[in-house]
Each structure stands twice: as C-alpha cells, then as structure tokens.
Interface confidence: low
Amino acid sequence: KKEDGESTAPTPRPKILRCKCHHHCPEDSVNNICSTDGYCFTMIEEDDSGMPVVTSGCLGLEGSDFQCRDTPIPHQRRSIECCTERNECNKDLHPTLPPLKNRDFVDGPIHHK
C-alpha cells in the first residue's frame, strides 16, 4: 500500500539517466554504467555465425528515435527495446529475436517498454 504523502503520479524520468551497459560501454563508464540524456536500451541480434548476442547501453536523445523503433538493415534479425522510466531500467528489458523477414525494412515500430 502507498504510504501517506507518497505520490501516485508517475515519476518523471531523470534528466540524466544511468543505464547498464554491456558490449556498448563508453570509455568513461564505471562499473558497466553509462549516462545519457536519452534512453537505456537492450538489444538482441544475430552475429555473423547466427548466434544471438545481447548488448545494452545508452542511447542519446538525438538519434534514438529510429534506434528504438526500426531495423534499418535488410533481412537482419535484430530487436531493440528502450526505456526511460528509471535508472538502469534496461536490466528488465528482454527483447527476443523477430522472425525472419523477406523485405527491405520494417515499417512497424519496435516496442518501447
């Protein structure tokens, strides 16, 4: 139950968001944590041998619109999920590989958590 005085309104996203990073950690990250003004992401994609690889990290606000939605590479299997609601929110993102597509690009948006 909510304690007295605790707001039920959604928490505003932090101005600077901390995200878990894995395979996508910038040089200045500490303890696998990066900072961004945009989104945290977790992504799954196939490597050259067809094995699924999971990466996570920070997306800048400028440039994240497509990255959190589309798969620009033809026929590539990749899924990305993004979040902004709290620090390290991408720990709880679990994207799954989409089925193979026989078309050049995906029109439909990829899910934002």
Partner: antibody, heavy 116, light 113 residues
Framework: QVTLKESGPGILQPSQTLSLTCSFS??????????VGWIRQPSGKGLEWLAH???????SYNPALKSRLTISKDTSNNQVFLKIASVVTADTATYYC????????WGQGTLVTVSA | DIVMSQSPSSLAVSVGEKVTMSCKSS????????????LAWYQQKPGQSPKLLIY???TRESGVPDRFTGSGSGTDFTLTISSVKAEDLAVYYC?????????FGAGTKLELK
C-alpha cells in the same frame, strides 16, 4: 557546437560515380544512437532523402535509388561518405548531410552538376 | 512509402497576418506506444539549408520563435505562424520520420502580397 560540411566534385559526366564527403565536428559517430543522413535538392525543387548511417554501421537507403547508393563512414576522422553510381543529369542537385533522425543540424550543401 | 502532401503550394501574405499551412500523410504518424507523432517541420530560406522548426509535430526546436506552432495528430498536421514577419518568407517543408524511406512534403512557399 555541431557543424557539418559537404564536399563533392562540382561537375561530373553522365555514367560516372559521384563521391560525396560529409565532414563534421561537435558530434561523434561512435556515440551510441548517433546517425547522419544525406538529402538532396534539385534547384527550385523539394527535398529528397537518400541514405542514413548509424553509429553501429546500420544503413538505410531510399528504395528508389538503392541500387546506385552506397553510404559509409570513417568514425575516427568524423566523416560520412555517399557514392552514387551511374549518374544522370537528373542527379544534378544540392546535396546536404544532416545529423540525427529528425535533421536538427544541416551542412551548407554542395552543388553537383551532371553534364555531358 | 508514406506520401506527404502539403497545401497550399504557395501562400501570399501580409506582414502581421496569421498563416496556417497543412501537411497530410498517407498513413498515421502516431506511434501508440509513446503517443508521439513522428513529424517535423523545416523552414528553408533562399540560398540556405533547411532549418528544423518543429519536431514530434508540436515541439518547438530550441531558439525557434514562439510565433511558430505545430499541431495535429495521426495524418493531419498544421503549421501556424501567429503573426508573419518579413524574415519568415521562405519555403516550409514537413517530413515524416515514422518509417523508411523518410519522406518530405513538396513544400509551401510563403510570399509577400
């Protein structure tokens, strides 16, 4: 401060390959989420998006021109390149590069004329 | 491809006049997961590069005067200039960034009466 600057050959002949360079500062294509796109504009006409490249080397092309376009990047030198093969006179235009998904920063443009 | 249609193609106005121009998309630009419309407006003056005015259909870019207002949702969008100044004479383009290929409207040219 973000700046972008396009460079190209100025004039070339039909059937040649057009090579364009976008040199930029104030942004890095190694930054996750960053992207740069190319747009062109024939004189007195509208804007046409050509291609886009992201920090992770994802690429997307205008399907109408895809067979002739190649976009690439040199992250360490802060440059993005566009090649258009087998140019025709209809490729005469001002070519712009711009940052991001919703082009917040544009270069000044470079005029390319295809003429026999 | 998403087709963007702008009207009118040109508009003769007097300084101080209120101006509205329309942009319609062939499919919805509203992404339900984040309730954002993936639409931008640009201003292009003669001999200059386009300049971003509005994104997310209604968010004014930093430094853009508040006489410029973007509105609309789904497939119908409007750019309004509350009181035209001489420096506003330009061509205005809308652009969708909902899906590939990115597409622009043909533009609305704002001219002096």
């Amino acid at each position: 401060q973000v700046t972008l600057k396009e460079s190209g050959p100025g004039i070339l002949q039909p059937s040649q390959t057009l090579s364009l360079t976008c040199s930029f500062s104030g942004l890095s294509l190694s930054t996750p989420g960053m992207s740069v796109g190319w747009i062109r504009q024939p004189s007195g006409k509208g804007l046409e998006w050509l291609a886009h490249i992201w920090w992770n080397d994802d690429k997307s092309y205008n399907p109408a021109l895809k067979s002739r376009l190649t976009i690439s990047k040199d992250t360490s030198n802060n440059q993005v390149f566009l090649k258009i093969a087998s140019v025709v006179t209809a490729d005469t235009a001002t070519y712009y590069c711009a940052r991001g998904d919703r082009f917040a920063y544009w270069g000044q443009g470079t005029l390319v004329t295809v003429s026999a | 491809d998403i087709v963007m249609s702008q009207s009118p193609s040109s508009l003769a106005v007097s300084v101080g006049e209120k101006v509205t121009m329309s942009c319609k998309s062939s499919q919805s630009l509203l992404y339900s997961n984040n309730q954002k419309n993936y639409l931008a407006w640009y201003q292009q003056k003669p001999g200059q590069s386009p300049k971003l005015l509005i994104y997310w259909a209604s968010t004014r870019e930093s430094g853009v005067p508040d006489r410029f207002t973007g509105s609309g949702s789904g497939t119908d969008f409007t750019l309004t200039i509350s009181s035209v100044k001489a420096e506003d004479l330009a061509v205005y383009y809308c652009q969708q960034y909902y899906s590939f290929p990115l597409t622009f409207g043909a533009g609305t040219k704002l001219e002096l009466k």
